[in-house]
């Protein structure tokens, strides 16, 4: 059987490459896991907007997860 | 940009089908979550179905599962809907609509999509 499997990541498509800053209410990371076999960043946006997938290897999301990771080590 | 233009629609009678076009100019659909959205006189717009651009996994509403399938054909930069067994309520204008940082549990949103088509009529009446 796979390690991983494909199906249960939260994203559907590759992701914006960008959201307005001043949209954000929070970014998520998801990391590689038994679910998904690729990181996942997902924004969640002000004013009960619902939610976006970030592409992982655009500019913003990298930042982002540095960000986050600096902050959670 | 992408522009999306709907057709296919029409006056059908119950128990009827239908197959919808979601063709794209002005850029590839590739890298799009596709989804078919209506809307009827007096209603808010609700998702019927999607389709994934990653791996190609499919999306419906509770509404119209089993009757509706969703397919999309790359190399024609289209999207269809092949509508079956159509009932009165299923009377609407259909839109397409594409969007990239589409979340699963958001896929049938209206929230999750970026650009619209026109949208064509479906009449279903005897």
């Known amino acids: 059987f796979p390690m991983f499997k494909r199906g249960r990541c939260l994203c559907i498509g590759p992701g914006v490459k960008a959201v307005k800053v001043a949209d954000i209410e929070k970014a998520s990371i998801m990391y590689p896991s038994n679910n998904c076999d690729k990181i996942e960043v997902i924004i969640t946006l002000k004013e009960n907007k619902g939610q976006r997938c970030l592409n992982p290897k655009s500019k913003q999301a990298r930042l982002i997860i540095k960000k986050v990771e600096r902050k959670n080590f | 940009e992408v522009q999306l233009v709907e057709s296919g629609g029409g006056l059908v009678q119950p128990g009827g089908s239908l197959r919808l076009s979601c063709a794209a100019s002005g850029g590839t659909l590739d890298d799009y979550v596709i989804g078919w959205f209506r809307q009827a006189p007096g209603k808010e717009r609700e998702g019927v179905s999607c389709i994934s651009s990653t791996d190609g996994s499919t999306y419906y509403a509770d509404s119209v599962k089993g009757r509706f399938t969703i397919s999309r054909d790359n190399a024609k930069n289209t999207v269809y809907l092949q509508v079956n067994s159509l009932k009165p309520e299923d009377t609407a204008v259909y839109y397409c609509?594409?969007?990239?940082?589409?979340?699963?549990?958001?896929?049938?949103?209206?929230?999750?999509?970026?650009?619209w088509g026109q949208g064509t009529q479906v009449t279903v009446s005897s």
């Open positions: 609509a594409a969007g990239m940082g589409v979340l699963r549990q958001w896929a049938l949103s209206k929230l999750s999509y970026d650009y």
